[in-house]
């Protein structure tokens, strides 16, 4: 169950999809990826206040226990709910080829 | 790909399964759950240093970009990789019934 999408911390402060531009060098991929030279990495960033985009029952439990024991139990964390696949031109010993990666770019986000 | 399981921060400091004892009151469940009165909640807690239990390519990217832009990109987060189901005796308008919840207790953990 995806709980409330209203962010009590103000617009854009809570868990949501962000895009970060990164070069192959930034990613440490220059030795095994030929293209693209730059990737628009979509990732999940932001706070997870009480019940905001709670992914499941476990996330709701985590919220309750974090409120009670903040030093022991961390707040839920903003992570991908699903991914968009991406193709890379990959260098191998036998040459270059197109390879699809299913878990590279976040598609949407939730708190867990 | 689950990357290295060696924790560079010292034993028990990195992302792993913890058990937290919680009452129905702690969980805010007293009004809709009859039993159990207390739950041994298994949850994922701990740091996610570079490539420790990286869940996938996205987690590896996050590690690289966090190193470059720590104020913009957070480190990967310790979350459940899978869950153990649990049965609860649930109160309803028509009485009580056994209900199984698949996403309540963490089974194992990874960094994402």
């Amino acid at each position: 169950a995806r709980n409330g999408d209203h962010c009590p911390l103000g617009p854009g402060r809570c868990c949501r999809l962000h895009t970060v531009r990164a070069s192959l060098e930034d990613l440490g991929w220059a030795d095994w990826v030929l293209s693209p030279r730059e990737v628009q990495v979509t990732m999940c960033i932001g706070a997870c206040p009480s019940q905001f985009r709670a992914a499941n029952m476990h996330a709701q439990i985590k919220t309750s226990l974090h409120r009670l024991k903040p030093d022991t139990v961390p707040a839920p964390c903003c992570v991908p709910a699903s991914y968009n696949p991406m193709v890379l031109i990959q260098k191998t010993d036998t040459g270059v080829s197109l390879q699809t990666y299913d878990d590279l770019l976040a598609k949407d986000c939730h708190c867990i | 790909a689950r990357n290295g399981d060696h924790c560079p921060l010292g034993p028990g400091r990195c992302c792993r399964l913890h058990t937290v004892r919680a009452s129905l009151e702690d969980l805010g469940w007293a009004d809709w759950v009859l039993s159990p009165r207390e739950v041994q909640v298994t949850m994922c807690i701990g740091a996610c240093p570079s490539q420790f239990r990286a869940a996938n390519m996205h987690a590896q990217i996050k590690t690289s970009l966090h190193r470059l832009k720590p104020d913009t990109v957070p480190a990967p987060c310790c979350v459940p990789a899978s869950y153990n189901p649990m049965v609860l005796i649930q109160k309803t308008d028509t009485g009580v019934s056994l209900q199984t919840y698949d996403d309540l207790l963490a089974k194992d953990c990874h960094c994402i």
């Epitope: 030929l34 293209s35 968009n84 696949p85 991406m86 193709v87 031109i89 270059v96 197109l98 | -």
Partner: antibody
Framework: QGTLKESGPGILQPSQTLSLTCSFS??????????VSWIRQPSGKGLEWLAH???????RYKPSLKSRLTISKDTSRNQVFLKITSVDTADTATYYC??????????WGQGTTLTVSS | DIQMTQTTSSLSASLGDRVTISCRAS??????LNWYQQKPDGTVKLLIH???NLHSGVPSRFSGSGSGTDYSLTISNLEQEDIATYFC?????????FGGGTKLEIK
Amino acid sequence: QGTLKESGPGILQPSQTLSLTCSFSGFSLSISGMGVSWIRQPSGKGLEWLAHIYWDDDKRYKPSLKSRLTISKDTSRNQVFLKITSVDTADTATYYCARSAYGMTDYWGQGTTLTVSS
Amino acid sequence: DIQMTQTTSSLSASLGDRVTISCRASQDISNYLNWYQQKPDGTVKLLIHSASNLHSGVPSRFSGSGSGTDYSLTISNLEQEDIATYFCQQYNMFPWTFGGGTKLEIK
């Protein structure tokens, strides 16, 4: 590995509209970076790039033919289409579709032949 | 449009020979060049991507080189199955353009 197969009418009369279909498997056009191109080759001549469609529905056309070309896709059915209006005998050729990403056009279909004749 | 010129339209060589096919662009294409092989039955296969990168599965006797406007494809030890027409193609900018092709025949 990607496999692609073109299909078309085979024969058209001048001024008619050509509708080509590229059916593919082994990849998806929902994948970021992926695209499909159409290329043609008149018998005994060279290759001519016509159009390209990206995963995000961005399209590119050969400028001299742009007014006559329309490329489109049905991502869920793994198909790409090309329409050429007002065909002429100069459009008689073998038409290929090919998978492409970042300029790497790695797999081509076997081609479908079109003859324009009155 | 960028013009791609393959000056040699046909080439005759013996089995075992080293064969070089050249391609010139009308402007600098920054190594954004593919080489293709087209068999007599019309089948087209990618050999080289980005001027010098062998496509996976292509025999290592094929190699590509060049920079700026001048590029070449080399077959180091010609085999019977290499009888085909070879095309260069630039993808530096749209519209993508091909060379006229070089038909390779056995002496």
